[in-house]
Interface confidence: medium
């Protein structure tokens, strides 16, 4: 119960998370700029990765997207790439981590299958979480370091236009939404580590092997199983024969030490 | 680069009409907001209206809404501004600008042309 509830719980977490990361990569709040402001009139301009935008006091807004790669900065490429492989890898991740919830019933997937698969997600969780804290942390340092560029600077493929004023930009919402973000993705897929362990069954030395005997003075083990062994090689611990039909419900797996909580 | 030149000042009386033209040259006209910016004898430079690089969108000051038009014809690489109910107070030089966005704020605008003067008077 706990590992299904921990599985759940990693899965709406990164889900959230990676929905913020999505979010914060098509917003234009990563650097805010007060280009002037006076009384009368106040001039915002903020950018994203993909376009820049200028708000009055007035009501006028107006969004221009990078039309250049060239002219952009390295860092502003770098980031570009890391949210989306962030992106890519929490999409993947949550594809995944719905087939390896323990809650949903895919053909006959044993426990083992779903514990890979829930390791796979939640490593793909924490790396995307990691991309997308990189990501934003490497804009904000461009924005501490005053290396992000001013606006017209930026668009020397329109032209070569120069900007009269530099100005500083200061931190957007973008960047605090991709922290939040990120960081539920690094815990979602921490949670979804975590779970597997507890979905994987116990290892042990010794590999049992369960039969029924054919006589009428057998003893019967609680769950419905007869009788077992400690010998021979039956790896996946199947019932060598089975004398009658018995439902699934009749049949109970192994314990783990997981499942006592 | 992008060069502007405006054209259409003179003299006209108070509630009369004039249309200041803006010719750019150059292939990239059509990249930049434009803008018109006034600067009357002793005064600052003052917003008066500006227009998208599509031509989608306008900005105009309070002090000219209703009066004034702007328009731009990228295939002929001109800006407009069409000007009515002209007052004493529009009395200025008015000069052409360009820049990446439509806005009020004269730090936008990179390219600026010569000016040219519109004096109201009786």
């Known amino acids: 119960m706990a590992v299904t509830a921990c599985q759940g719980l990693g899965f709406v977490v990164s889900l959230i998370g990676i929905a913020g990361i999505i979010a914060a990569t098509c917003m234009d709040q990563w650097s805010t700029q007060d280009l002037y402001n006076n009384p009368v009139t106040a001039v915002f301009n903020y950018q994203g990765l993909w376009r820049s935008c200028v708000r009055e006091s007035s009501g006028f807004t107006e969004c221009r997207g990078y039309f250049t790669l060239l002219g952009l900065p390295a860092m502003l490429q770098a980031v570009r790439a890391l949210m989306i492989v962030g992106i890519v890898l929490g999409a993947i991740g949550l594809l995944v981590s719905i087939f390896a919830l323990k809650c949903i019933r895919i053909g006959s997937m044993e426990d083992s299958a779903k514990a890979n698969m829930t390791l796979t997600s939640g490593i793909m969780f924490i790396v995307s979480g990691l991309c997308a804290i990189a990501g934003v942390s490497v804009f904000a340092n461009m924005l501490v370091t005053n290396f992000w560029m001013s606006t017209a600077n930026m668009y020397t493929g329109m032209g070569g236009m120069v900007q009269t004023v530099q100005t500083r930009y200061t931190f957007g919402a973008a960047l605090f939404v991709g922290w939040v973000a990120g960081g539920l993705t690094l815990i979602g897929g921490v949670m979804m580590c975590i779970a597997c362990r507890g979905l994987a069954p116990e290892e042990t030395n010794y590999k049992a092997v369960s039969y029924h005997a054919s006589g009428h003075s057998v003893a019967y083990k609680p769950g419905g199983f007869k009788a077992s062994t400690g010998f021979g090689s039956n790896t996946k611990n199947k019932k060598i024969y089975d004398g009658g039909a018995r439902t699934e419900d009749e049949v109970q797996s192994y314990p783990s030490k997981h499942d006592y909580v | 680069e992008v060069q502007l030149v405006e054209s259409g000042g003179g003299l006209v009386q108070p509630g009369g009409s004039l249309r200041l033209s803006c010719a750019a040259s150059g292939r990239t006209f059509s990249n930049y907001a434009v803008g018109w910016f006034r600067q009357a004898p002793g005064k600052g430079l003052e917003f008066v209206a500006a227009?998208?690089?599509?031509?989608?969108?306008?900005n105009y000051a309070d002090s000219v809404k209703g009066r004034f038009t702007i328009s731009r014809d990228n295939a002929k690489n001109t800006l407009y501004l069409q000007m009515n109910s002209l007052r004493a107070e529009d009395t200025a030089v008015y000069y052409c600008a360009g820049g990446f966005f439509a806005t009020s704020y004269s730090g936008n605008y990179g390219y600026w042309g010569q000016g040219t003067l519109v004096t109201v008077s009786s």
């Open positions: 227009i998208t690089w599509s031509g989608g969108s306008t």
